[in-house]
């Protein structure tokens, strides 16, 4: 049994790190493999992660962590029974993929403005809580070429756009993702999208 592609891991910098790797041939990951991980900090216990299959030769493991500080380093040992297949380490703060924002809501009760709000996926005691910036993707359901990205570089998880910049009488969808600048993270996954109907009409004089 051989590792074809060594484990690579990303952390949500809160409670889960996800490691993926590829084996040399078809493998029943959960039956044949175990990924052991241990925080390099005094008297930290060794935890065992049971991997799941991710395609024929791919495996994925979700490492659970109680908290994270920037200096954390974990040792990783991939075992097949009594055989050590791979040994490595992982520093969560250097491989951060933020959690996706949630609760994306569109408010259209102000006649000439579309207000989008969403929730920061981190609690206030997490370093990323005050470090996230967002990208909001808005697109026309009937015309995928009519799509735009709004970068939200301020902390407040809201975006206001003039309704007049969207086509009238059309259904739009929006989704949002996040990244954290200080940790130079990758982008999060997109949030689930939300849909609304743009009923805005230009004032008669402007038609």
């Amino acid at each position: 049994m051989k590792v074809l592609q060594e484990p690579t891991c990303v952390s949500d910098y809160m409670s889960i790190s996800t490691c993926e790797w590829k084996m040399g041939g078809p493998t029943n990951c959960s039956a044949e493999l175990r990924l052991l991980y241990q925080l390099v900090f005094q008297s930290s216990e060794t935890h065992t992660c049971v991997p799941e299959n991710n395609g024929g030769v791919g495996c994925v493991c979700h490492l659970l962590m109680d908290d994270v500080v920037s200096m954390d380093n974990y040792t990783l040992d991939l075992w097949a029974g009594q055989q050590l297949l791979w040994k490595g380490s992982f520093k969560p703060s250097e491989h951060v993929k933020p959690r996706a924002p949630g609760n994306l809501t569109v408010h259209t009760n102000v006649s000439d403005t579309v207000l989008l709000t969403w929730s920061n996926p981190y609690p206030p005691d997490n370093y990323l809580y005050n470090d996230l910036t967002y990208a909001v993707n808005i697109w026309n359901e009937n015309d995928l070429a009519d799509s735009r990205i709004h970068n939200v570089t301020y902390l407040k998880p809201t975006l206001r756009i003039p309704a007049s910049t969207l086509k009238s009488g059309i259904s739009y969808r929006a989704r949002v993702r996040a990244w954290a600048q200080h940790y130079n993270t990758t982008w999060s996954e997109w949030s689930p999208s939300t849909k609304w109907y743009n009923s805005y009409r230009e004032p008669f004089e402007q038609r």
Epitope: M14, I16, F41, D66, V69
Partner: antibody, heavy 116, light 112 residues
Framework: EVQLVQSGAEVKKPGATVKISCKAS????????MHWVKQAPGKGLEWMGR????????IYASKFQGKATITADTSSNTAYMELSSLRSEDTAVYHC?????????WGQGTLVTVSS | DIVMTQTPLSLSVTPGQPASISCRSS???????????LEWYLQKPGQSPQLLIY???NRFSGVPDRFSGSGSGTDFTLKISRVEAEDVGVYYC?????????FGQGTKLEIK
């Protein structure tokens, strides 16, 4: 052996400022969050705030925002807390505690007495 | 802020008898990561507090097995199966799930 050794007792006048220290041995403070807990005479424990010593990121209980300032010097493996505009209500024992991710290690406490 | 309410506030127990302390939180203390950071600390006379139980049920290393924690949601309990003279002091519950973290007001245990 893990130890948190705090600076000695202080007597201060109202309006003054005090800075107390907490030196860690047996572990690196960069590997933990360092917290401060207040205990007024004959009273219970009150969480004040914490710091991630690596990046200096602090968070405080609203009651202590503006009153306490928590800092850390990773080169000397020491956390600090400064209390400003002291009043008689600030008379208490202040404990530093490392949390990873529970309060396993406590300093011996520093008594700050505010008296005119 | 989450308020942690302990009952009783004082307890007088005969050595060898059981003791139970209740802790109720004003709202759920399940962290966003799914864990419940409910801890119990004992402050013996003249000493700093010491950790007994973490994450509701887990005994910290070196803590005698006569101490046990239980509960979920907003109701938690610390039990001492047979109280010993060295168990005297003030017991505090603590939630470390939501900022600001908060302690209960303490329960004083004395020996009859």
């Amino acid at each position: 052996e893990v130890q948190l050794v705090q600076s000695g007792a202080e007597v201060k006048k109202p309006g003054a400022t005090v800075k107390i220290s907490c030196k860690a041995s047996g572990f690196n403070i960069k590997d933990t969050y360092m917290h401060w807990v207040k205990q007024a005479p004959g009273k219970g424990l009150e969480w004040m705030g914490r710091i991630d010593p690596t990046n200096g990121y602090t968070i405080y209980a609203s009651k202590f925002q503006g009153k306490a300032t928590i800092t850390a010097d990773t080169s000397s493996n020491t956390a600090y807390m400064e209390l400003s505009s002291l009043r008689s209500e600030d008379t208490a024992v202040y404990h530093c505690v490392s949390r990873r991710p529970w309060f396993a290690y406590w300093g011996q406490g520093t008594l700050v007495t505010v008296s005119s | 802020d989450i308020v942690m309410t302990q009952t009783p506030l004082s307890l007088s127990v005969t050595p060898g008898q059981p003791a139970s302390i209740s802790c109720r939180s004003s709202q759920s203390i399940v962290h966003s990561n799914g864990n419940t950071y409910l801890e119990w600390y004992l402050q013996k006379p003249g000493q700093s507090p010491q950790l007994l139980i973490y994450k509701v049920t887990n005994r910290f290393s070196g803590v005698p097995d006569r101490f046990s924690g239980s509960g979920s949601g907003t109701d938690f309990t610390l039990k001492i199966s047979r109280v010993e003279a060295e168990d005297v002091g003030v017991y505090y519950c603590f939630q470390g799930s939501h900022v600001p973290y908060t302690f209960g007001q303490g329960t004083k245990l004395e020996i009859k």
